[in-house]
Interface confidence: low
């Protein structure tokens, strides 16, 4: 559950985040699971720990393995696992499936291809983009921050897109590449002001203290592929990542589904070991797209245990 797959290429930088998150003030210790050997924090090492991040600068095939991170606070320890695989560079152009990040879709009106994992790195624009190993050229392609924007998308634009950037660590530069597939949707779609299907507005969800609870934020945005549509959770008006409660986590990545032809997104909020203070929080499901933003609020209430003796 608290394990994450990460992969990279030899001689490139790879940065991995601990799957268990905590406040910035918490200390995070990293270990190589096979030997239980502590990962050093000194930056002179090729592989070193830096808080929630584990850095391979650069990575080597021999670094492959499972790494344990332990988030330590004054009151608890949380353990996570990073399953790291470093591959040899391919001599030919084909990018194997195991090196591919999630597929994204576009349509003729708009398209954005996000460079995967880039937020973990210290990079500067512009990114370099390649399609099927060829550098992209022409006015239809725009490297915009961490995105590639393709104007007037055609079916021939489908393919594997690789972003390449430089990670800088204390003046030293390391190359990073990441590849994902891009598909082109032909359908005529439309987008609407977000419609939140769940939770209901001002919903009260019953939970049991000490148990785990899940809240799902689900919204529909129109028909066909939607651009710049998102659902997310806030706690007391604060982003989950800023709130700093490691027990409450937003599921990474949004699930896209098509319900009755409508494009919908859902985001699960997982609350581990529900506590009394969780009942005092306001949970907001936010749905936003180019048309606007909509919120539904949920509060938690204690589920009364069933009296089996009556």
């Amino acid at each position: 559950k608290f394990s994450k797959q990460s992969w990279g290429l030899e001689n490139e930088a790879l940065i991995v985040r601990c799957p268990r998150q905590g406040k910035p003030s918490y200390t995070v210790d990293w270990y190589y699971s096979q030997t239980n050997k502590s990962i050093p924090t000194q930056e002179r090492n090729r592989v070193f720990a830096s808080g929630q991040l584990l850095k391979f600068l650069p990575a080597a095939v021999a670094d492959s393995g499972i790494y344990t991170c332990i988030v330590r606070s004054p009151t608890f320890n949380r353990t996570g696992y990073a399953n790291v695989t470093i591959y040899k560079k391919q001599s030919d152009c084909n990018v194997p499936d195991y090196l591919m990040y999630s597929t994204v879709s576009g349509s003729e009106k708009n398209s954005k291809i996000y460079c995967p994992t880039i937020d973990l790195y210290n990079w500067t624009a512009p990114l370099e983009w390649f399609k099927n190993c060829q550098a992209l050229q022409g006015s239809r392609y725009r490297a915009h921050k961490s995105f590639l924007v393709i104007d007037n998308v055609m079916t021939e634009d489908a393919g594997d897109y690789t972003c390449k950037f430089i990670h800088n660590e204390n003046g030293a530069n390391y190359s990073v590449t990441a590849t994902r597939s891009f598909t082109v949707k032909d359908e005529q779609g439309f987008s609407l002001f977000p419609v939140i299907g769940a939770p209901a507005q001002n919903e009260i969800k019953e939970v049991e203290i000490g148990k785990n609870a899940n809240l799902t934020c689900s919204a529909c945005f129109g028909k066909g592929t939607q651009f710049l549509a998102a659902v997310l959770w806030q706690l007391n008006g604060t982003k989950i990542t800023d709130f700093g409660e490691p027990r409450i986590q937003q599921e990474e990545g949004q699930n896209q589904s098509f319900s009755n032809g409508l494009a919908c997104l859902d985001m699960v909020l997982r609350i581990a070991d529900v506590k009394e203070e969780d009942l005092l929080l306001q949970y907001d499901c936010l749905a936003l797209n180019l048309h606007g933003l909509r919120r539904h609020t949920v509060r938690l209430s204690r589920k009364n245990p069933i009296d089996h003796h009556s």
């Epitope: 008006g237 800023d242 180019l290 933003l293 609020t297």
Partner: antibody, heavy 119, light 107 residues
Framework: EVQLLESGGGVVQPGRSLRLSCAAS????????MSWVRQAPGKGLEWVSS????????YYADSVKGRFTISRDNSKNTLYLQMNSLRAEDTAVYYC????????????WGQGTMVTVSS | DIQMTQSPSSLSASVGDRVTITCRAS??????LNWYQQKPGKAPKLLIY???TLQRGVPSRFSGSGSGTDFTLTISSLQPEDFATYYC?????????FGGGTKVEIK
Amino acid sequence: EVQLLESGGGVVQPGRSLRLSCAASGFTFSSYWMSWVRQAPGKGLEWVSSISSDSSYKYYADSVKGRFTISRDNSKNTLYLQMNSLRAEDTAVYYCARDGLRWDAFDIWGQGTMVTVSS
Amino acid sequence: DIQMTQSPSSLSASVGDRVTITCRASQSISSYLNWYQQKPGKAPKLLIYAASTLQRGVPSRFSGSGSGTDFTLTISSLQPEDFATYYCQQSYSTPLTFGGGTKVEIK
């Protein structure tokens, strides 16, 4: 010191265009959503438009949709409002405002720039 | 669109008075309600966000309460510098909307 400074206001004839600028300083401009809010003489506040930190999201009031365009240049720490097909009812003081990082509230405001649309 | 209705539109009060301004939303906005103060010829200033959270640097005599559709801004003991116009604003959904304002004048 955190500061927003609007410029570009003035007197303009109906149907003409004007471009407002807002120079930001004292904070990491590229991390914040930014907005324009206006106030007609003797009237209340009216939200005009908002733009996300990376320009992905742009929202407009119905009264300006199709005529006004919000944009930003993070490299120059500057927010813009391109106003086309101006009408008499667009006459107002235009404020540039910063949206809070953690809450949707306008926590920093500029001093405002006056736009007068008159023939 | 969500309409925000403020009342009263104006009030007269003396220094030291307790002043209450109300704001009503046309639909539930949870606690996505902000309060601003504006003095003549000046830009608005954020007083309270999230219905009841005091913005840094704002005196504690200002307080906010409410949730859903009904909200209140209270000044516990009016000071000379508090004579101004106060606006509520919802940030629940776009388009963002303000109340019509409440002008607090010297009695």
